[in-house]
Interface confidence: low
Amino acid sequence: AGVFELQIHSFGPGPGGAPRSPYSARGPCRLFFRVCLKPGLSEEAAESPCALGAALSARGPVYTEQPEAPAPDLPLPNGLLQVPFRDAWPGTFSLIIETWREELGDQIGGPAWSLLARVTRRRRLAAGGPWAGDIQRAGAWELRFSYRARCELPAVGTACTRLCRPRSASRCGPGLRPCAPLEDECEAPPVCRAGCSLEHGFCEQPGECRCLEGWTGPLCMVPVSTSSCLGLRGPSSTTTGCLVPGPGPCDGNPCANGGSCSETPGSFECTCPRGFYGLRCEVSGVTCADGPCFNGGLCVGGADPDSAYICHCPPGFQGSNCEKRVDRCSLQPCRNGGLCLDLGHALRCRCRAGFAGPRCEHDLNDCAGRACANGGTCVEGGGAHRCSCALGFGGRDCRERADPCAARPCAHGGRCYAHFSGLVCACAPGYMGARCEFPVHPDGVSALPAAPPGLRPGDPQRYP
């Protein structure tokens, strides 16, 4: 078991690509990617399912194209695309990466998504190796990406078929005494040929050095693309020793049904129009074998061959290919200003302070039916309800008899007297103020605010 990981680095017009986007007339959009893995390098079975697995990326940031502006690299979704595989990693595989464009404007008469580009690579790759980089052209577009396969413990090895047993395991049969701890049974990786590139080479037998795709040489140090003669076909030139151009794999356009041809080392690749698949775009129509249902949709054969499949979408998705996330929050199910969260499998409402319930329907701060005792009045505000209590009472519901002097509010030795409308401080000599907080100078003038008219230092100060 293990995981195939794909990292998309950029997607945009290739060199000499479209001067401006062919989609510029449309409104805001965002990209997402679909990856499909098929075992083996065979060119047959173009319609075979993604037997090794498939994955769909998150949607990328929203991008609004400027009608006359050059098409830039389009903003990409974050994160890796990960395709778990259950069984052995086959080593040779076909990697299909589809770039999809999701329209966000009002869509009239058609799906809100379209396939921008589809690249298919046939590759050899050992599990546990480093990231392999690639650049692929699809029509006017260029896709840059890296990928790798890694095993998940306890599986190890280039095919993830060897099971690694940690040292602590023991191998005793039933009823036998415990054995001595085993030596680590995880096989050490074979020692490759001295100097074999750690990045671009790998080995399965000691002393060998096998190169990852795109690298060559005895130590896998030479990138295939650096050869000065690469890409030229035909008879050898006597002057340079290089090949002179001959007929190319795209000559005569082997791509059927309007597919566009791009050359790959020693071969060609067809970028097919919508509704066509296969090495030469020769497969028309889409069936369940193509894996057309996104987001975990279940594909079944349609009763009508003009729609040869039907996608049964999981909760939270809709569209003929389950490609559209249902915006269940647009119905504003959360009341009282609650924040709506669509978790895919369920809706959640994050309620504002003072509200509760699955849809924030319960107002915890509601004065309705909430009595304040002992003549207190209920006041709503600040996201909470409170009782404004009559004098002499306190607490959340004004049920507690309040002693205004309990908190010893009179400073500098002033004495506190409970009063029908609050409390009164009788200040010690030399202090004045509602709480006896201000010292009085010997000349009878206060150091801070002037005493209110009619009050002299030492008089009781009433604190409302």
Partner: antibody, heavy 116, light 107 residues
Framework: EVNLEESGGGLVQPGGSMKLSCVVS????????MSWVRQSPEKGLEWVAE??????????HYAESVKGKFTISRDDSKSRLYLQMNSLRPEDTGIYYC???????WGQGTLVTVSA | NIVMTQSPKSVSMSVGERVTLSCKAS??????VYWYQQKPEQSPKMMIY???NRYTGVPDRFTGSGSATDFTLTIRSVQAEDLADYHC?????????FGSGTKLEIK
């Protein structure tokens, strides 16, 4: 109920032209790729041409034998499919059927006879 | 072009018998194969799509099978109303092509 009804067939001289029409009801015409298929005793069933949707810019495909001679078109607002046939030859004789793209729905056919 | 070859050219069966019609493609067409029934003086009618899917309203005595190059239409218990020509066709690649048909006659 799905119904496709062809019209416009008849007798035409070699080298002549003819335009077939097909009116569709019972399904959303604008959502379907459409084709013309012909049938003759000599050649049996023979696919002639296909037209896709507005979202595909009404892309068309033709059998090699009619390329450059026949033109398929559609009018989604009228749910109509057309086949303009030029430079007709005797081997173009047959019953012409209007069909949905994977031939689930068929009209009753219209007979085209190319003869001097 | 992909050639679809049907056999036999014609077959005569009694009511209640089982009949098997064959269609061979000149190259791999996956499961993009269709079977049509054409009764005298009528237009073809779809019976099977995707090699093995029975079309809406088609009786379950009709069964399609096969993939790649060899395809079969089986009628489990032939009825008098099954008298017709049966055509296979492929939509795997352009141009779409049809077989020349098998005529089913009832004894």
């Amino acid at each position: 109920e799905v119904n496709l009804e062809e019209s416009g067939g008849g007798l035409v001289q070699p080298g002549g032209s003819m335009k077939l029409s097909c009116v569709v009801s019972g399904f959303t015409f604008s959502n379907y790729w459409m084709s013309w298929v012909r049938q003759s005793p000599e050649k049996g069933l023979e696919w002639v041409a296909e037209i896709r949707l507005k979202s595909d810019n009404y892309a068309t495909h033709y059998a090699e034998s009619v390329k450059g001679k026949f033109t398929i078109s559609r009018d989604d607002s009228k749910s109509r499919l057309y086949l303009q046939m030029n430079s007709l030859r005797p081997e173009d004789t047959g019953i012409y059927y209007c069909t949905s793209n994977r031939f689930a729905y068929w009209g009753q056919g219209t007979l085209v006879t190319v003869s001097a | 072009n992909i050639v679809m070859t049907q056999s036999p050219k014609s077959v005569s069966m009694s009511v209640g018998e089982r009949v098997t019609l064959s269609c061979k493609a000149s190259e791999n067409v996956g499961t993009y194969v269709y079977w049509y029934q054409q009764k005298p003086e009528q237009s073809p009618k779809m019976m099977i799509y995707g090699a093995s899917n029975r079309y809406t309203g088609v009786p379950d005595r009709f069964t399609g099978s096969g993939s790649a190059t060899d395809f079969t239409l089986t009628i489990r218990s032939v009825q008098a109303e099954d008298l017709a020509d049966y055509h296979c066709g492929q939509s795997y690649s352009y141009p779409f092509t049809f077989g020349s048909g098998t005529k089913l006659e009832i004894k």
